[in-house]
Every structure is written in C-alpha cells, then in structure tokens.
C-alpha cells in the first residue's frame, strides 16, 4: 500500500463530486522478479455498475502506448483482459472496488519508466480519469542465479548437461568438468529475457561438471555429478 510522502494524489473537481487517483511515486524491483504497481481511485458516480475499462499505459499520460487493458461488463466484477503486452501484465485489483493495481511479471531493465493508470466508465455515466504523474518503476540489475542444472540422456547412450541462469544483465555461462585441458565447450543460447541457458552436449567422462554464471554484479556456481555404473547408464547428482 502506498502511504506518506510517496503518494501522488491527483484530482479534479467535477460539477458535483470529485475524481481522484492515488499512486505511489515510485516502485522498486529487481530484474527477473515481479512488481506491483498500485493504483486506486475515487469517482463522483455513486453506485456506478455499468461497463468499465481499465487501462495502463507507459511513457506518458493520455498518449503513451497501452501495456494493459481490460473490460468489465455491466454488473460484473471480472475484468476481461483485452491487452497484456508480452503476456506479462495482470490486473490484481478490482476496478469495481476502485482498485486498478497491476502486477508486472518477469521484469527486465527495459521495463523501467513511468506507468499511468486510467479508468473509463462507458455506460450512462460517460466519464474517465487518468493519472497524470503516474508511478515510476525502477528495475534494478540482478546478480546471477542458477535456476536449473541437470544431466539428460543424449544420443547414442551419451549424456548432456543443461544449465539455466538468470540475471540482469544476462550472465555469461561457462561449463567446466573432468575433461583434460580447459573448460569444456558449451553451446550457449539466449533464453527468455533475463534467463540464459548453456548446454554441454557430450559428457565424455564421469565426474563433477560445474556451471558458472557471471555478470557485472557477481557470479554463481552449481555442479552436477555424472557416474555411470557398469554397463547401465545412470547419473548421480
């Protein structure tokens, strides 16, 4: 909940009563995490139960691109999503209860910026209001974290290892293992946003295989162990 100095309250006087919108000045979150952008409002149309639309846009008020939009039918508390940019935006609040709070999943540094909430009454009480100042979302960089490391069956009774890490900036991944010489060659591919996956395609020897993820904020390591018992392929991790 927003409170104290962080609160922007925006209002205008309608002929009878008053619109207002409450949003925090700023929300901070780490890349890869989720953030909630709070937005509540009051309006002059008592007991309004007609159709309504909730909108969030980025960049600038009134004219910026919409990142989320949902519509609630008359009498309904369900706001059906019509737009969710990249599928990462979800309404947490209930517009019927004057709450437009939005959840943003899988944050990336590029999500930093200002977000503006808007509510539109599209029935008899034809009216709308939009936050002028908005809420500033600050997405901070994240040190690497290895989220999955595993050994999987490969072709011709061989094995391969997969390592998935996340961080912002996206970390560089490297494999090392019992093979003689330098680190084993790894196939690295960019994953979804802040996630990166690297594959070690052929584990030729038993032993410990270590995945290292590094970016400008730090490094992380995780290991798997490969043991093949007699003629029966198997792994121990």
């Amino acid at each position: 909940d927003a409170s104290g100095d962080l609160l922007n309250t925006e209002a205008h006087s309608a002929p009878a009563q008053r619109w207002s919108m409450q949003v925090p000045a700023e929300v901070n979150a780490e890349a890869g995490d989720a953030a909630v952008l709070p937005c509540t409002f009051t309006h002059p149309h008592r007991h309004y139960d007609g159709p309504l639309t909730a909108i969030w846009r980025s960049g600038e008020p009134y004219a910026g691109p919409q990142v989320f939009r949902c519509t609630a039918a008359p009498g309904s508390e369900l706001c059906q999503t019509a737009l969710s940019l990249h599928g990462r935006f979800r309404l947490l609040g209930n517009p019927r209860r004057n709450d437009l709070s939005l959840r943003v999943e899988r944050l990336a540094l590029a999500d930093s910026g200002r977000y503006f909430c808007r509510v539109e009454f599209t029935g008899d009480a034809h009216d709308r209001y939009e936050s002028r100042h908005g809420v500033r979302l600050r997405v901070t960089a994240a040190a690497p974290r290895i989220v999955n490391i595993s050994v999987l069956p490969g072709p011709a009774h061989a094995f391969r290892a997969l390592c998935t890490a996340e961080g912002e900036p996206p970390p560089a991944l490297a494999w090392s293992g019992p093979a003689p010489g330098n680190s084993s060659a790894a196939l690295q591919g960019q994953g979804h946003g802040y996630q990166v996956t690297a594959e070690l395609p052929a584990l030729t020897r038993d032993g410990r295989y270590t995945c290292t993820a590094a970016n400008s904020l730090g490094r992380a390591e995780a290991s798997v162990y490969l043991f093949r018992f007699h003629g029966a392929p198997g792994t121990s991790t």
Epitope: H12, S13, A14, P15, W19, T53, I55, R57, P61, Y62, A63, G64, Q66, R69, L83, R118, E120, T122, H126, R128, R132
Partner: antibody
Framework: EVQLLESGGGLVQPGGSLRLSCAAS????????MSWVRQAPGKGLEWVST????????YYADSVKGRFTISRDNSKNTLYLQMNSLRAEDTAVYYC???????????????WGQGTMVTVSS | DIQMTQSPSSVSASVGDRVTITCRAS??????LAWYQQKPGKAPKLLIY???SLQSGVPSRFSGSGSGTDFTLTISSLQPEDFATYYC?????????FGQGTKLEIK
Amino acid sequence: EVQLLESGGGLVQPGGSLRLSCAASGFTFSSYAMSWVRQAPGKGLEWVSTISGGGGSTYYADSVKGRFTISRDNSKNTLYLQMNSLRAEDTAVYYCAKAIGSSWYSDAFDLWGQGTMVTVSS
Amino acid sequence: DIQMTQSPSSVSASVGDRVTITCRASQDISDWLAWYQQKPGKAPKLLIYVASSLQSGVPSRFSGSGSGTDFTLTISSLQPEDFATYYCQQSYSIPYTFGQGTKLEIK
C-alpha cells in the same frame, strides 16, 4: 507510415446519399476511437460522430442524428460515414480523426486525414 | 451542450512576438481541452491536449494552461510558420465542441 486517407466525397443533390471511407494505416486501428469532423467552407470545425474502438458504441451530433451512420471494419482498418437525406448545410470538408490513447474516448484528435469535400446542391 | 468561446477572433502580430489566445467553456470541463492549428487547405494539427500536454513533435514555444472554464494557448516567440487559425476543443462530454477559431495574422 501512420496516416488516414478519406475518400467518397463529391457532389450530391439534396435528399441524396453518400458514403465516406477512411483508410487507416500505421497503427492498431481497433485500439482507438475514431471520429468524423467537418468544416463548412470558410467556417470553423464541427464534430459529427464518434465510434468506439470495437464499434459497439456510436455518438452523433444532433444536427446529423438519424441521417448519418458511423461504422468501422477493423479487419479492413477502415472507418465509414453513411450520409442519407443530405441537406445543403451538410456541405463541408469531412475529416476522419483518430482519438489519442483510448478506444472509447476522444481526449483529443491526434491524427487527421486530408479531408474529402462533400457538396450538397441542386 | 458545452459552448466554447475563443478570444480574440483574430490577432495581428509580428515574428518574435509573444501571443496569447484564450478559450472559455460554458461549464467546468476540468482539463479536457485540446488546441489545434490549421493552415488554409490543410487538416487541423494537434498542438496541446489535456489543457497543458504538448503533443509529440510540436515546438516547445507552444504551451497550454488552465483548468475548469478558462484556458490559454501561448506562443512564446512567433515564427513565420505559426501564422494560422487556432481552435480549442472540449472533450469533457459529448457532443465534443470547438471554439469558433482565432486567426493569427502577420502584422
């Protein structure tokens, strides 16, 4: 390129009909309310009609209510104005205009077509 | 319907001048007001929306202010390309209505 292009204007006799079209490109047409605004020769601007992004709601100026019908085909990115029972006072340049930032409301018109001239005369 | 009244209806000014055009609404429209510029034979162009927000691409010499019933468009230093007709428009309620226009002419 973001643009609106009107067509369908011309000379018509009083009581006649005309259908104006407005082809949109360069933006997500269905996400925005669209309007028609007209301007009689040497006069100011007059709002004529607005339609919501999905086409479910339409609004008209009293001067054209019952005679004009606004519609849209979002699959073709096209806005229409069907004008029936035309009168001499309907003579004007007709502009189609896009609402800024909303599929329901025209907080302002941020994109205009070049206009098409409709002349009602016998 | 909400009536929009602009003043003056015409104004003569010179390049470099500061010019102010006012628009009055017949009832409170909060800040749901836009300003447009129109040149002969051309479509209107949005300058200001929601009373004071400058439309993208519009020079910063244009500014808008006001709320409720009284609004102002100011051009801080007139340029040759600014000579045109200016309209205000309320979007508070339907029917949307425009002012009668202010013609800005070269002195």
